[in-house]
């Protein structure tokens, strides 16, 4: 506890102090007092710098004195031999003795008393900014008229803060302007305008005179403008050093004027007004602003329209324009929205074709569709090249957004047929020579694939079995081969309306209109062993002449066996119809004259015993296309004959092209359209 006075005696005083002692006393008097410490007796072993024995007086970090030896009073009326006066309320006394004393020393006696200090005069740093008043144990500060004492109870300032300006126009000046401003003051002025308006401050150079900066460039007195997180200033000096027009970009402005104790000048005067908050004319790429203005301010609305090929993507919805409003904070609404390149997305895949994975699917990108060559080609033209258009679709110059269609190439065998040994009279063939060849297992017969969904055959093949099982892609019709080949499932059988249905088909003598179509449930995938034959054109180029050669193929009867294991084929010439009439029917079921011959029939064969026979029915009589020698078309279908190994009769397909096309169109799936 602090005390007002006290006594300090060396150990054993007044007896001799012991050797090797170190003792300290912490003196503390109340706040606001100094300490007067005085010694009335001092008898300590003398040494240079009091190195052996000593009494040390310490104030804070400062040694006020170090004593040793003997002292006596200079004043007969006073017992004081040594004294110390400190203006602080704490003091430390330390006594030390070494290991030996040559004589008997009695030590010291000291006293301390609390003394008043004059804070107003005793210190280098004046505690009060204006008037200092001392009293015993303390002091107080006071101020001149119109000044008030700050909370620190030391500094005086003028009451110049707290003003809030809300008018859209106004004037503010430093206290007493143009008389000198008060020293040691902090004046704060607030301007608070309606949202959407920015404070614009205007000053004239001559309306500003504030104590200049020190040699380091720091303003001693300063004027600062704070708008949100932006600061203008500090400003000081003679004549306003900043911009004479300050656009704060904020509706709230704080003006802070800080002065020190010295150097008062006339101060400053400013005007302010509220401007509608401007929004920057932003550079939004790939877009147009409507209306176009040099300056946009609070509440202005613009429509931002994307250029062709660009869109605004918000969530999953794409739009070509959006509205943006200049907001009260000087920022545009919807500023996150951007005109991005239209993304056409991953292009749709197409049946029997492909599209390379595009490097980009954005506006202007190009993709190319190709068909699975050589089995498919692009039917609807356009070259297969599509670009990503402004509307977000992949577009072709010819087809627009319509996708290309890959359709089977017809009439082109992967390997040409070469006649080998004579077999009735034909040769071994490979399915790759006749990829259109279809095998019917019940009845044992043939057919011709004409596109993905349709098989052409003879009416007499399907009249007794409207759900025939068919196979494609196999040279051999052995069971193990068929199990590995492609089985075709019929959806519907269409027999030509001119085909006469009989109760006893075995006794048939009229094979006119011996033609039928089988619609398949699923499309056939084309390849080297499966691809369609072309249909004849309707022009006279497709009228057959006697001697024109055609190819027949099938698994029908041969000289050696009822049914061929592997595909057989032969090249036959077209013959006049009378040649067929002249041949005697081998096993007539009726009178020879009863057999009907019509222009819907082609007669072919007669050379080297090459002919079609039982089990070949429905297969194509394939003739080279007169307009494209690389292709074959189905000129005929194996129909009937008077005798195997002579001449055979074939349905003249050209006469049925209209019926074929009509039937296919009327029974196509939407996917085929």
């Amino acid at each position: 506890e602090p005390t007002m006075y006290g006594e300090i005696l060396s150990p054993n005083y007044p007896q001799a102090y012991p050797s090797e002692v170190e003792k300290s006393w912490d003196i503390e008097v109340p706040e606001g007092y100094g300490i007067h410490l005085y010694f009335t007796h001092l008898d300590i072993e003398l040494s240079e710098n009091c190195a052996y024995d000593s009494v040390q007086i310490i104030s804070g970090d400062t040694e006020e004195g170090r004593l040793c030896g003997q002292r006596s009073s200079n004043n007969p009326h006073s017992p004081i031999v040594e004294e110390f006066q400190v203006p602080y309320n704490k003091l430390q006394v330390i006594f030390k003795s070494d290991f030996s004393n040559e004589e008997r020393f009695t030590g010291f006696a000291a006293y301390y008393v609390a003394t008043d200090i004059n804070e107003c005069t005793d210190f280098v740093d004046v505690p009060c900014s204006h008037f200092c008043n001392n009293f015993i144990g303390g002091y107080f500060c006071s101020c001149p008229p119109e000044y008030f004492l700050h909370d620190d109870m030391k500094n005086c300032g003028v009451n110049c803060s707290g003003d809030v300006f809300t008018a859209l126009i106004g004037e503010i000046a430093s206290p007493n302007y143009p008389k000198p401003y008060p020293e040691n003051s902090r004046c704060e002025y607030q301007i608070r305008l309606e949202k959407g308006f920015q404070v614009v401050v205007t000053l004239r150079r001559e309306d500003f005179d504030v104590e200049a900066a020190d040699s380091a460039g720091n303003c001693l007195d300063s004027l600062v403008f704070v708008a949100g997180d932006r600061q203008f200033g500090p400003y000081c000096g003679h004549g306003f050093p900043g911009p004479l027009n300050i656009e704060t970009k904020s509706n709230a402005l704080d003006i802070i004027f800080q002065t020190d104790l010295t150097g008062q000048k006339k101060g400053w005067k400013l005007r302010y007004h509220g401007d509608p908050m401007p929004c920057p004319k932003e550079d939004t790429p790939n877009s147009v602003w409507e209306p176009a203005k040099a300056k946009y301010v609070f509440r202005d609305v613009v429509q931002i329209t994307c250029l062709d090929g660009f869109e605004v993507v918000e969530g999953r919805v794409g739009a070509t324009s959006f509205y943006s409003t200049c907001q009260s904070n000087g920022k545009w609404s919807n500023s996150k929205l951007k005109c991005q390149p239209v993304d056409c997305g991953i292009p749709e895949s197409i049946e029997n074709g492909k599209v390379e994975d595009p490097e980009s699917t954005l506006f202007g990108s190009v993709i190319r569709y190709t068909c699975e060559e050589p089995y498919y080609y692009m039917e609807n033209g356009g070259g297969g090249e599509y670009h990503c258009a402004g509307n977000g679709s992949w577009v072709n110059e010819v087809l627009g957004p319509e996708l290309p269609k890959c359709v089977p190439v017809c009439g082109v065998p992967r390997e040409p047929f070469e006649e080998k040994q004579r077999i009735i009279g034909g040769s071994d063939a490979d399915i790759k020579n006749f990829p259109w060849q279809v095998f019917f297992d019940n009845p044992w017969a043939g057919g011709a694939l004409i596109n993905e969904y349709w098989v052409l055959t003879a009416a007499h093949v399907v009249e007794g079995n409207r759900e025939p099982t068919m196979y494609v892609g196999s040279t051999s019709v052995q069971t193990s081969r068929l199990a590995k080949s492609k089985m075709l499932t019929p959806e519907h059988v269409f027999i030509h309306p001119g085909w006469k249905l009989l109760e006893v088909p075995e006794g048939r003598t009229n094979f006119d209109n011996d033609i039928a179509l089988v619609r398949l449930k699923d499309p056939v995938k084309m390849g080297p062993t499966v691809s369609p034959i072309c249909l004849p054109g309707t022009s006279s180029d497709y009228n057959l002449m006697d001697g024109d050669l055609g190819l027949i193929s099938g698994w029908g009867r041969t000289e050696k066996r009822d049914r061929a294991v592997r595909l057989k084929a032969a090249r036959l010439p077209v013959a006049p119809l009378r040649k067929c009439k002249e041949v005697k029917v081998e096993k007539p079921t009726a009178d020879a004259e009863a057999y009907v011959f019509t222009p819907n029939m082609i007669c072919a064969g007669g050379e080297k015993g090459m002919d079609s026979c039982k089990g070949d029915s429905g297969g194509a009589f394939a003739v080279q296309d007169p307009n494209d020698k690389t292709k074959f078309y189905a000129a005929g279908l194996v129909s009937w004959g008077p005798q195997c190994g002579t001449y055979g009769l074939y349905t003249r397909v050209k006469n049925y092209v209209d019926w074929i096309m009509k039937t296919m169109q009327e029974n196509s799936t939407p996917r085929e359209d």
Epitope: D441, N442, T469, S476, Q478, T479, L482, A483
Partner: antibody
Amino acid sequence: EVQLVQSGAEVKKPGASVKVSCKVSGDTLTELSMHWVRQAPGKGLEWMGTFDPEEGETIYAQKFQGRVTMTEDTSTDTAYMELSSLRSEDTAVYYCVTEGLGGRPFDHWGQGTLVTVSS
Amino acid sequence: DIQMTQSPSTLSASVGDRVTITCRASQSISSWLAWYQQKPGKAPKLLIYKASSLESGVPSRFSGSGSGTEFTLTISSLQPDDFATYYCQQVNSYDWTFGQGTKVEIK
């Protein structure tokens, strides 16, 4: 009409081999696919393998792999089946059979050859 | 390999009965299934091929049905000549495999 005539019955000791022949008449071996099927006394039918002329390879049932060899002599229209490392459970009637067309597994069967494996 | 399982192993029936034999494949074989009849000391005789096609010369009382993995052979009215062992066989892929057989005997 196709006929298949097989070689006569055989008695073999365990560990020995047997070779059964099958002569084709009424057709040529090149036009046919020959399969071999066996039937142990009082047991079911077991498919052993075939020569696939389309692939030009012989396909053996997994069970007989490494023990059976099927060959053909097209000049005599004769097919052969040789089974080695015989054991008692190989005692069976061995049939040669021609593959059928249009979904029929087998067309013509030989009369069968009884092979007895006994020590 | 595709396993073929026939049921029942033995079937006792009388003349005139309707008889059904079932064959189950361990995986789909589409319609590539045949049925045979075998009498003691004889080679098997083909009855049905492609699951439901009747071999020529086979009486119409025999019929086959099914596809995928479940197949049946039906004899609509059992005749004295029909007492024999019946086998199913898959020909979808090699190895071609037979069922273990169903013996139809007189009740």
